[in-house]
Interface confidence: low
Amino acid sequence: PSGLVTANITDSEALARWQPAIATVDSYVISYTGEKVPEITRTVSGNTVEYALTDLEPATEYTLRIFAEKGPQKSSTITAKFTTDLDSPRDLTATEVQSETALLTWRPPRASVTGYLLVYESVDGTVKEVIVGPDTTSYSLADLSPSTHYTAKIQALNGPLRSNMIQTIFTTIGLLYPFPKDCSQAMLNGDTTSGLYTIYLNGDKAEALEVFCDMTSDGGGWIVFLRRKNGRENFYQNWKAYAAGFGDRREEFWLGLDNLNKITAQGQYELRVDLRDHGETAFAVYDKFSVGDAKTRYKLKVEGYSGTAGDSMAYHNGRSFSTFDKDTDSAITNCALSYKGAFWYRNCHRVNLMGRYGDNNHSQGVNWFHWKGHEHSIQFAEMKLRPSNFRNLEGRRKRA
């Protein structure tokens, strides 16, 4: 015979074809062997011109031989080489599917591999590829979009060889609040680590605001709107700066009166103040807290005290905000100017958390009068807010 070729090669099969001998022959003897694979020999009829090779090992180079027989006579042997495909991984499955994460698992192919190519694609056409090592049989997908259909595919790699892809389809869980309007809704979405989050004022995706969420204090879900901790940020700022906000959300900052107004206009909010000084801690919670709009000069409403720091904010209830360039307090002097800060001053303050850091002169520092008086500047202070009914929501969420 002549012209021995192989076709239709897969990971376990191939088809051998040849040109028949010119003379009539009784049979053809076909043998094939590969590395670490014992030789297999088959005899087929003399009028056959192809033979299906089955049960082959994947990713293996085979040597195929064929000769013709007529009675006791044998023709010369012709040879061809071919390599089987790499077999695919098996049983690709998505488990532990959450709103933004999923775990892909699979069983390895029979052939040895040098790695795997993972491709996952969302319905909107976003495609991501990742190559993982040969001993890996699972991979955690992160940063997925909630309520989204995904197709995940995997392909085994062995040097230049690539297996067929197998795939699985899964859908991420929908977020309870796709556009959380505060840190409590972010928390109810399952985010439980304190840090930077994007919230959406009134749940409007066009009104995005980056905030720091305290997810640990008293059950979490707090938007932090003021932090004093080291004196690096200048809090002696003008009206415009206090309206807009300033500082680094991870460090010392003020979130901004406009933002506070918009947030507290979303519903009923409570205020929490956490204070720390030389290992001592104190807190104050007010179950009704709101900040008016610019027309009211960001008028403060704060009621319903509980805590350990003392009710110093009651003195400021109903007051408008004051800065050195916009004096709205009831004192003869300009409180903000006198105390180098800004606040809902009255005449002038029992609370001065935006005062001069580390200044222990009377009323100049970071003061909470009913805890440390007017002549002690507190080392650490945070003001934060969350919905007043958070406990109720959280309790219902846990129980229902």
């Epitope: 309520s147 929908g174 309870l176 796709p178 556009f179 109810l188 749940g203 409007d204 519903g267 009923q268 919905p387 007043s388 009914n389 109720n392 929501l393 309790g395 219902r396 969420r397 129980r399 229902a400």
Partner: antibody
Framework: EVRLVQSGAEVKKPGASVKVSCKVS????????MHWVRQAPGKGLEWMGG????????IYAQKFQGRVTMTEDTSTDTAYMELSSLRSEDTAVYYC????????????WGQGTLVTVSS | DIQMTQSPASLPTSVGDRVTITCRAS??????LNWYQQKPGKAPRLLIY???TLQDGVPSRFSGSGYGTDFTLTISSLQPEDFATYYC?????????FGQGTKVEIK
């Protein structure tokens, strides 16, 4: 599993009041957000009022304001809906339903109570 | 108050059909929308909450989509037990109004 069992059918005269009860089992009433929905014969669903976790209070649809009172007896885990000054158009099946988690979706429903207002 | 408008009011259809019901809110309600199914003489049953989240035990042929003011309930392949009336409900803020209902009936 929450189960809501409502009181039986009532026939009332125009101008009278009716009080429908809804007994909760499987959970305590304090753990749930109770709502009332009615459905006139051959008509759609009409939300009457219920506990709004957002405000922490019971709110009523404008249409029923002043005529409806929703109360709870936590000692017996029973909710009540009282509708006064009844008129013929108040003939309907009245359902109690509880809201799921903080999604406010009405997950569990009573079997309904038919209130007929007729002279 | 937020008004909810469903269309169509009735939908003659056959088993195996793909069914789409729309619901429009008179104001922006984000994704705060529920869908219910009601059969004659029975209490309503929650199908989908938060616009697209399938309630436990509801077959996957039901799906919800939409955001803001326009929402859709889809039944990918109608089954005999799906002939019923479907209602959308605003859950953005009280009063939590329902749509007027869409009756899916046999053609």
């Amino acid at each position: 599993e929450v189960r809501l069992v409502q009181s039986g059918a009532e026939v009332k005269k125009p101008g009278a009041s009716v009080k429908v009860s809804c007994k909760v089992s499987g959970y305590t009433l304090t753990e749930l957000s109770m709502h009332w929905v009615r459905q006139a014969p051959g008509k759609g669903l009409e939300w009457m009022g219920g506990f709004d976790p957002e405000d922490g209070e019971t709110i009523y649809a404008q249409k029923f304001q002043g005529r409806v009172t929703m109360t709870e007896d936590t000692s017996t885990d029973t909710a009540y809906m009282e509708l006064s000054s009844l008129r013929s158009e108040d003939t309907a099946v009245y359902y109690c339903a509880t809201a799921q988690k903080e999604t406010y979706a009405l997950t569990y429903w009573g079997q309904g109570t038919l209130v007929t207002v007729s002279s | 108050d937020i008004q909810m408008t469903q269309s169509p009011a009735s939908l003659p259809t056959s088993v195996g059909d793909r069914v789409t019901i729309t619901c429009r809110a008179s104001q922006y309600i984000q994704g705060f929308l529920n869908w219910y199914q009601q059969k004659p003489g029975k209490a309503p049953r929650l199908l989908i909450y938060a616009a697209s989240t399938l309630q436990d035990g509801v077959p996957s042929r039901f799906s919800g989509s939409g955001y803001g003011t326009d929402f859709t309930l889809t039944i990918s392949s109608l089954q005999p037990e799906d002939f019923a009336t479907y209602y959308c409900q605003n859950q953005y803020r009280g009063p939590w109004t329902f749509g007027q209902g869409t009756k899916v009936e046999i053609k």
